[in-house]
């Protein structure tokens, strides 16, 4: 998390800044949502605990052709220490239910806001 450059300013970005920018992007998505996000695409829900950023990316990376979440996908890749490819799921990612991308984004946003308030930037 020491090298999360490329989102708003060049060079390394502090974890708190990177998290705030991710939250802002998710807020932007939810507020600008007119038609169903990503045409109602469904993705695997995630456990919002350990390995959350990689798990979120593992779910969202499978959705292609949805410009609304492309920036979120890029930002999440900065939080995940390993490369994630479509169709790849770690052992931590329990695939037990699929939800619409819009709900996924809302759930993720609520959790990230909580982490930010608590000062958990990693």
């Amino acid at each position: 998390l020491t090298c999360l450059g490329g989102f708003a300013s060049p060079g390394p970005v502090p974890p708190s800044t990177a998290l705030r920018e991710l939250i802002e992007e998710l807020v932007n998505i939810t507020q600008n949502q007119k038609a169903p996000l990503c045409n109602g695409s469904m993705v695997w829900s995630i456990n919002l605990t350990a390995g959350m950023y990689c798990a979120a990316l593992e779910s969202l990376i499978n959705v292609s052709g949805c410009s609304a979440i492309e920036k979120t996908q890029r930002m999440l890749s900065g939080f995940c220490p390993h490369k994630v490819s479509a169709g790849q799921f770690s052992s931590l990612h329990v695939r037990d239910t699929k939800i619409e991308v819009a709900q996924f984004v809302k759930d993720l946003l609520l959790h990230l806001k909580k982490l930010f308030r608590e000062g958990q930037f990693n």
């Epitope: 045409n39 469904m42 959705v63």
Partner: nanobody, 116 residues
Framework: EVQLLESGGGLVQPGGSMRLSCAAS????????MDWVRQAPGKGREWVSS????????WYADSVKGRFTISRDNSKNTLYLQMNSLRAEDTAVYYC?????????WGQGTLVTVSS
């Protein structure tokens, strides 16, 4: 162009069985995870089940686990949903979907009504 055509719906009594089919065309069916999604009258869309490209991996919503079985025949480009022990709350329009694509790529759906 992706096309998905569901069939097999209808009226069935509680406790009965029904098998839905979905004929796929316009993409390499065997390469993709597939979903069944349903929408009950006046409700939102609910994920029912998914199956991996080869058919060896399957997943189910808790509400249908042990009652529904998803399967596929890649030689026929067809997806199936065997539904047993049907309940009134299973009444819905059932859609098959190419996973991770929006409802622009879903079929028109088939209505399943569970009623005595």
């Amino acid at each position: 162009e992706v096309q998905l055509l569901e069939s097999g719906g209808g009226l069935v009594q509680p406790g009965g069985s029904m098998r839905l089919s979905c004929a796929a065309s316009g993409f390499t069916f065997r390469d993709y995870e597939m979903d069944w999604v349903r929408q009950a009258p006046g409700k939102g869309r609910e994920w029912v089940s998914s199956i991996g490209p080869s058919g060896s991996e399957t997943w189910y919503a808790d509400s249908v686990k042990g009652r529904f079985t998803i399967s596929r025949d890649n030689s026929k480009n067809t997806l199936y949903l065997q539904m047993n022990s049907l309940r009134a709350e299973d009444t819905a329009v059932y859609y098959c979907a190419k996973a991770y694509t929006g409802f622009g790529y879903w079929g028109q759906g088939t209505l399943v009504t569970v009623s005595s």
